[in-house]
């Protein structure tokens, strides 16, 4: 079930998802001047088996001026710099989320993408939050919100995040570490059946990656 | 490849049917949508049906146009019955997501429905 809005916005912060439910959908866009090729894929669709998941459909732009130019390859580092995306783009891959069950990994860019990447999130999906460079985190519990189902309905948990703008180098001080504690999270719905496929297993995920999200400076 | 792939569109006289077909070939099975654009207008919804086949409409539609999916078939359709000239426009399908404009879905080519005397 796809989440009916996209994660909770909070002021001088970004959130990365570090690993992608089956069922993610991403748009499959191009950047001003280059256009889906004919016939090529709307999205690119995580899917998967028990043991493996990969992303389906590969995006495919071509110049919106030549009919017949199709590319599909690995950009420029200049054009890997134009592309920006609602979410932050982290310095490093932690080696962990490859290894998460019924999970895709960020996909590769495709040459001529668009500058923003959209993605559609499954129930259940966890997305990290940081500090934008120039702010640093005061935590009341974890920085991160998932994606639930109750009663029906879709809606993220509010991370519990606060990006001060003090002049600090560092935004994530190893002191300030997110709580591994859910009383930071508050539930107003407790009587109501939440299902949250994989919820569990992505805490494990997320504790085990704390360090490598949270103590390195946002580039 | 996820393909949406609209037909059944053309010309049709007020007061007359339509039946539109998307066939969503690579999709999973999420809530899908059938949007409109008229000219020099913006995209809008004009129905949606949820996995489980909970079905809502735009205010201008309801009681006219019914939306159905065949799960098996990965095909959504929109019936259009006693169609307007207002219902004019570039018929698309593609997922829904309740709070998500459809500025942020990656689009098809669509199906012409235009309706004149």
């Known amino acids: 079930e796809l989440c009916d809005d996209d994660p909770p916005e909070i002021p001088h912060a970004t959130f990365k998802a570090m690993a992608y439910k089956e069922g993610t959908m991403l748009n499959c866009e191009c950047k001003r001047g280059f256009r889906r090729i004919k016939s090529g894929s709307l999205y690119m669709l995580c899917t998967g088996n028990s043991s493996h998941s990969s992303w389906d459909n590969q995006c495919q732009c071509t110049s919106s001026a030549t009919r017949n130019t199709t590319k599909q390859v690995t950009p420029q580092p200049e054009e890997q710099k134009e592309r920006k995306t609602t979410e932050m783009q982290s310095p490093m891959q932690p080696v962990d989320q490859a290894s998460l069950p019924g999970h895709c990994r960020e996909p590769p860019p495709w040459e001529n993408e668009a500058t923003e990447r959209i993605y559609h999130f499954v129930v259940g999906q966890m997305v990290y939050y940081q500090c934008v460079q120039g702010y640093r985190a005061l935590h009341r519990g974890p920085a991160e919100s998932v994606c639930k189902m109750t009663h029906g309905k879709t809606r993220w948990t509010q991370p519990q995040l606060i990006c001060t703008g003090e002049m600090e180098t560092s935004q994530f001080p190893g002191e300030e570490k997110p709580q591994a504690s859910p009383e930071g999270r508050p539930e107003s719905e407790t009587s109501c059946l939440v299902t949250t496929t994989d919820f569990q297993i992505q805490t494990e995920m997320a504790a085990t990656m704390e360090t490598s999200i949270f103590t390195t400076e946002y580039q | 490849e996820v393909q949406l792939v609209e037909s059944g569109g053309g010309l049709v006289q007020p007061g007359g049917s339509l039946r539109l077909s998307c066939a969503a070939s690579?999709?999973?099975?999420?809530?899908m949508g059938w949007y409109r654009q008229a000219p020099g207008k913006q995209r809008e919804l004009v129905a949606s049906?949820?996995?489980?086949?909970?079905?809502g409409y735009a205010d201008s539609v309801k009681g006219r146009f019914t939306i159905s999916r065949d799960n098996a078939k990965k095909t959504v359709y929109l019936q259009m019955n006693s169609v307007r000239p207002e219902d004019t426009g570039v018929y698309y399908c593609?997922?829904?997501?309740?709070?998500?404009?459809?500025?942020?879905?990656?689009w098809g080519q669509g199906t012409q429905v235009t309706v004149s005397s």
């Open positions: 593609n997922i829904y997501r309740s709070q998500v404009p459809p500025t942020r879905y990656s």
């Open positions: 690579g999709m999973p099975l999420v809530a």
């Open positions: 049906i949820s996995s489980g086949g909970n079905t």
